[in-house]
């Protein structure tokens, strides 16, 4: 069974998938469509790297642009370095500026909804 066939079988169960499952899926050439990606739990999407999301979505990655202001895409973008987002060539904006340090202060983030940044 190839990645696409596997994805079709598990698609309806993905809404509650944890980050670990999404990371594993990204290695299986599933080419997740954006409609499915938008239904994923925000907390499961946030830890994914740009490379992992690119692999997870495959050719559908260009669809991130159209949804960049909708959750979970919006919140995921806020967590990525702008340099990394730029590698996608989609014109995604809102990433962490170059030279900034991300502090993983869970309390700060829980209160503000965004990561704590220290300037250069």
């Amino acid at each position: 069974m190839n990645g696409s066939e596997y994805f079709v079988k598990i698609q309806s169960f993905l809404g509650g998938a944890p980050t670990e499952d999404l990371k594993a899926l990204s290695q299986q050439n599933v080419s997740m469509d954006l409609a499915t990606f938008m239904k994923l739990r925000t907390d499961a999407v946030l830890p994914l790297t740009v490379a992992e999301v690119q692999k997870l979505l495959g050719p559908h990655v260009e669809g991130l642009k159209a949804e960049e202001r909708h959750r979970p895409v919006r919140d995921w973008i806020l967590r990525q370095r702008q340099d990394d987002l730029d590698t996608l060539g989609l014109g995604l904006q809102g990433g962490i500026p170059n030279g900034y340090l991300v502090l993983d202060l869970s309390m700060q983030e829980a209160l503000s909804g965004t990561p704590c940044l220290l300037g250069p």
Epitope: L34, A35, A66, R69, H70, R71, G91
Partner: antibody, heavy 119, light 108 residues
Amino acid sequence: EVQLVQSGAEVKKPGASVKVSCKASGYTFTDYNMDWVRQAPGQGLEWMGDINPSTGGTIYNQKFNGRVTMTEDKSASTVYMELSSLRSEDTAVYYCARRRIGTGYFDVWGQGTTVTVSS
Amino acid sequence: EIVLTQSPATLSLSPGERATLSCSASSSVISSYLSWYQQKPGQSPRLLIYRTSNLASGIPARFSGSGSGTDYTLTISSLEPEDFAVYYCHQWSSFPYTFGGGTKVEIK
């Protein structure tokens, strides 16, 4: 057949609100966002915002400054656009238009709803 | 916001002639994020072209699109009577999404 059927024409007084509906049929409702675009008499097209029917997430054009609200009823495959604090310049035809999630173009449009704001 | 300026505002041509419509953006638009719509009087807009040059379903091959950066073009190779309408370009490269002011193609 894919269809978007909108509610009928409305006449409203300045300061009132209007709620326009758009009923979708012939496709998987949650695979497409629904956008709203308006057109004042003799004018061009203006994008108002969109809603993701699957999550209820919305994005609005800042021009409407909190006056627009978009909602959905998945069980009825219907989206709604409410515009409040109406003024004469809100007189326009309001269109719903579907947009496949992950794309930015509108491949099917409703027939339009004429909203007239007049004292 | 990105302002899309369409020119000319009105194009007077005869059936069989070639129509060239221009859409100029106030700042660069990624070509994948530009589309064209046709609107006839009393009707809803209809998608013609997406991603600058891809024909929408059911659109005849006499329509074509091209361009990049700030300059985009819609071409109708040989006008048919049903092509006389208003044409709008639309960008979703930058928020808020915007439309051009339209070009009316009328019968000469």
